[in-house]
């Protein structure tokens, strides 16, 4: 178990021409807040994939009012870190989405209004317990600067938070075969229940006797880097079973290389061979290159041969954004007939048909809805001789002519907070609830008769998949 921490340093106009207008004005003062969504692994991001590692919302930032005539400065930020607790092993590789939201504080009917200002996404490798990694991401004309790290919650330690520490039984030394627990030198490593010999740096287990490898490592004991099949250390007696050399004690013990780097000895000390995307003496500095696969949805990465040069994602048809993370509106192909309104739902195209028409592409004439006009993309729904308008998100009333706050219907259950923007609704759940609408109380294992989860339990729930 542990916590992913995100520190936002600045959010403001990026370099170059086309500086964005300030999101706030004297008439509409506003303040910012941020949402982070974490997913495990480097797999392509599914359009509706949940924030399976967890999600978090920041506090609101200070109220900001634009000074007339002044360029948009870096905007005032919320205090503190965004913290996403994770319960299982830290996966080592993860995808993130960071959203910048604006809360307008003008004379809004029904309270403040929220809108999404910018959204950045990326994929990174990160070892728990390492230093802060710095990053810069751009979304349109906006630039977001931030740092992040993953740290283990005691008693867990290690790059995946899978090793356990416990207080020393004697003040002088740890028990037989147990090492001091860096960085908690006054504690000792708890006996591992993993398979004997399983690498404490590169392997972990969720059940006794198994040895599962972090990305970049292989072999029955997770001691072999994926990049090479030969052994790294030239010392020690030969092992007949693997043909490898078993290292004795040396400067590489405990692997000082972060982020999956492999250690080799030098005459004076050690040297880290870093995976692509990381550099520095101990591979502690992260820089993203094309080799890290930063382009989502099959995008082609160009440039970025070294971490200091930028990469560019050339997106396939249907996707856009600096990381090809946004879907292009496929409705430009005009698939809806008879004047139907096309909606791109991500996983499918949908046609909202004009009154009198129905079918997946509005190809069928209907009598029940003839002469019945639903405005703003509403659909006339017929059934049993009756007909009504089923309104698109954000509209209501008999003919869908009235603007409606999607959150006014209170879709979030059990005290969840609702946020609305162009692609749908977001529910931020209160502790102890899960589901996109926070509709399910979490019942911890073996306690299914309880009415809800105990206070303070935070499920790593998908919430809404933006």
């Amino acid at each position: 178990a542990g916590v992913f921490e995100l520190q936002i340093h600045s959010f403001g106009p990026g370099p170059g021409p086309g500086a964005p207008r300030s999101p706030c004005s004297a008439r509409l003062p506003c303040r910012l807040f941020f949402r982070v969504c974490l997913k495990p692994g480097l797999s392509e991001e599914a359009a509706e994939s949940p924030c399976a590692l967890g999600a978090a919302l920041s506090a609101r930032g200070p109220v900001y009012t634009e000074q007339p005539g002044a360029p948009a400065p870096d905007l005032p930020l919320p205090d503190g870190l965004l913290q996403v607790p994770f319960r299982d092993a830290w996966p080592g590789t993860f995808s993130f989405i960071i959203e910048t939201w604006r809360e307008e504080l003008g004379d809004q009917i029904g309270g403040p209004a929220w809108s999404l200002l910018a959204r950045v996404a990326g994929r990174r490798r990160l070892a728990a317990g390492g230093p802060w990694a710095r990053d810069i991401q751009r979304a349109g004309a906006w630039e977001l600067r931030f740092s992040y790290r993953a740290r283990c919650e005691p008693p867990a330690v290690g790059t995946a938070c899978t090793r356990l520490c416990r207080p020393r039984s004697a003040p002088s030394r740890c028990g037989p075969g147990l090492r001091p627990c860096a960085p908690l030198e006054d504690e000792c490593e708890a006996p591992l229940v993993c398979r004997a010999g399983c690498s404490p740096e590169h392997g972990f287990c969720e059940q006794p006797g198994e040895c599962r490898c972090l990305e970049g490592w292989t072999g029955p004991l997770c001691t072999v880097p994926v990049s090479t099949s030969s052994c790294l250390s030239p010392r020690g007696p030969s092992s007949a079973t693997t043909g490898c050399l078993v290292p004795g004690p040396g400067p590489c013990d405990g692997n000082p290389c972060a982020n999956g780097g492999s250690c080799s000895e030098t005459p004076r000390s050690f040297e880290c061979t870093c995976p692509r995307g990381f550099y520095g003496l101990r591979c502690e500095v992260s820089g993203v290159t094309c080799a890290d696969g930063p382009c989502f949805n099959g995008g082609l990465c160009v440039g970025g041969a070294d971490p200091d040069s930028a990469y560019i994602c050339h997106c396939p048809p249907g996707f856009q954004g600096s990381n090809c993370e946004k879907r292009v509106d496929r409705c430009s192909l005009q698939p809806c007939r008879n004047g139907g309104l096309c909606l791109d739902l991500g996983h499918a195209l949908r046609c909202r048909c004009r009154a009198g028409f129905a079918g997946p592409r509005c190809e069928h004439d209907l009598d029940d809805c003839a002469g019945r006009a639903c405005a703003n993309g509403g659909t006339c729904v017929e059934g049993g001789g009756a007909h009504r308008c089923s309104c698109a998100l954000g509209f209501g009333g008999r003919d869908c002519r009235e603007r409606a706050d999607p959150c006014a219907a209170r879709p979030c259950a059990h005290g969840g907070r609702c946020y609305a923007h162009f692609s749908g609704l977001v529910c931020a759940c209160a502790p102890g609830y899960m589901g996109a609408r926070c509709e399910f109380p979490v019942h911890p294992d073996g306690a299914s008769a309880l009415p809800a989860a105990p206070p303070g339990l935070r499920p790593g729930d998908p919430q809404r998949y933006l």
Epitope: P411, A413, P444, S448, P459, P462
Partner: antibody
Framework: EVRLVQSGAEVKKPGASVKVSCKAS????????MNWVRQAPGQSLEWMGI????????SYNQKFRGRVTLTVDKSASTAYMELSSLRSEDTAVYYC???????????????WGQGTTVTVSS | DIVMTQSPKSLAVSLGERATINCKAS?????VSWYQQKPGQSPKLLIY???NRYTGVPDRFSGSGSATDFTLTISSLQAEDVAVYHC?????????FGQGTKLEIK
């Protein structure tokens, strides 16, 4: 093709436990909640519970009073439903069903397993 | 728990004719989904969000209603539509279903 394939029929004695498996394929297992729904002979559908396959968080129908346990094996893309202290009225077909959300956050079961018949008889 | 009541319990309709099944919730559920279950098979999704037809479902199936009263309509009954139809609500925990409506050919 998205598929949920369940384990075979089971015959159990009253008081015993049964564990039914549901193997998912054709999609990323951890991207969708998994539900369990049962149907007794000649009866309607009855929701038993839901699990978040990545975190393992669960929510159960109180009717089952702690008798049901939902688990997953992420590496095998498989969900499990264990029902203990079986009685004759637990004789039913047990289904796993993937949970999906529409644009207004309306939840629905879009893919169902083929069902596993559990017979409880002395 | 929210009680979902379907009517009628069984229904016989001639081929090509319209079939209508109702579902009433004991309190506001916002929307329902409809499932078709043929003999010996698992349920299949037809309609979600009260009126959205699921991918691949023929357009003779339509759903309507809101709050507590919902309707599934088959505009022109086909032989392959013989099945039990279930409504279900996912608005409120615990999720609940109607008792089912058996549709046959007259």
């Amino acid at each position: 093709e998205v598929r949920l394939v369940q384990s075979g029929a089971e015959v159990k004695k009253p008081g015993a436990s049964v564990k039914v498996s549901c193997k998912a394929s054709g999609y990323t297992f951890t991207d969708y909640y998994m539900n369990w729904v049962r149907q007794a002979p000649g009866q309607s559908l009855e929701w038993m519970g839901i699990i978040n396959p990545y975190q393992g968080d669960t929510s159960y129908n109180q009717k089952f009073r702690g008798r049901v346990t939902l688990t997953v094996d992420k590496s095998a893309s498989t969900a499990y439903m264990e029902l203990s202290s079986l009685r004759s009225e637990d004789t039913a077909v047990y289904y796993c069903a993937r949970y999906h959300y529409g644009p207004h956050l309306e939840g629905y079961f879009d893919v169902w397993g083929q069902g596993t018949t559990v017979t409880v008889s002395s | 728990d929210i009680v979902m009541t379907q009517s009628p319990k069984s229904l016989a309709v001639s081929l090509g004719e319209r079939a209508t099944i109702n579902c009433k919730a004991s309190e506001n559920v916002g929307y329902v989904s409809w499932y078709q279950q043929k003999p010996g098979q698992s349920p299949k999704l037809l309609i979600y969000g009260a009126s959205n037809r699921y991918t691949g479902v023929p357009d003779r199936f339509s759903g309507s209603g809101s709050a507590t009263d919902f309707t599934l309509t088959i505009s022109s009954l086909q032989a392959e539509d013989v099945a039990v139809y279930h409504c279900g609500q996912s608005y409120s925990y615990p999720l609940t279903f109607g008792q089912g409506t058996k549709l046959e050919i007259k």
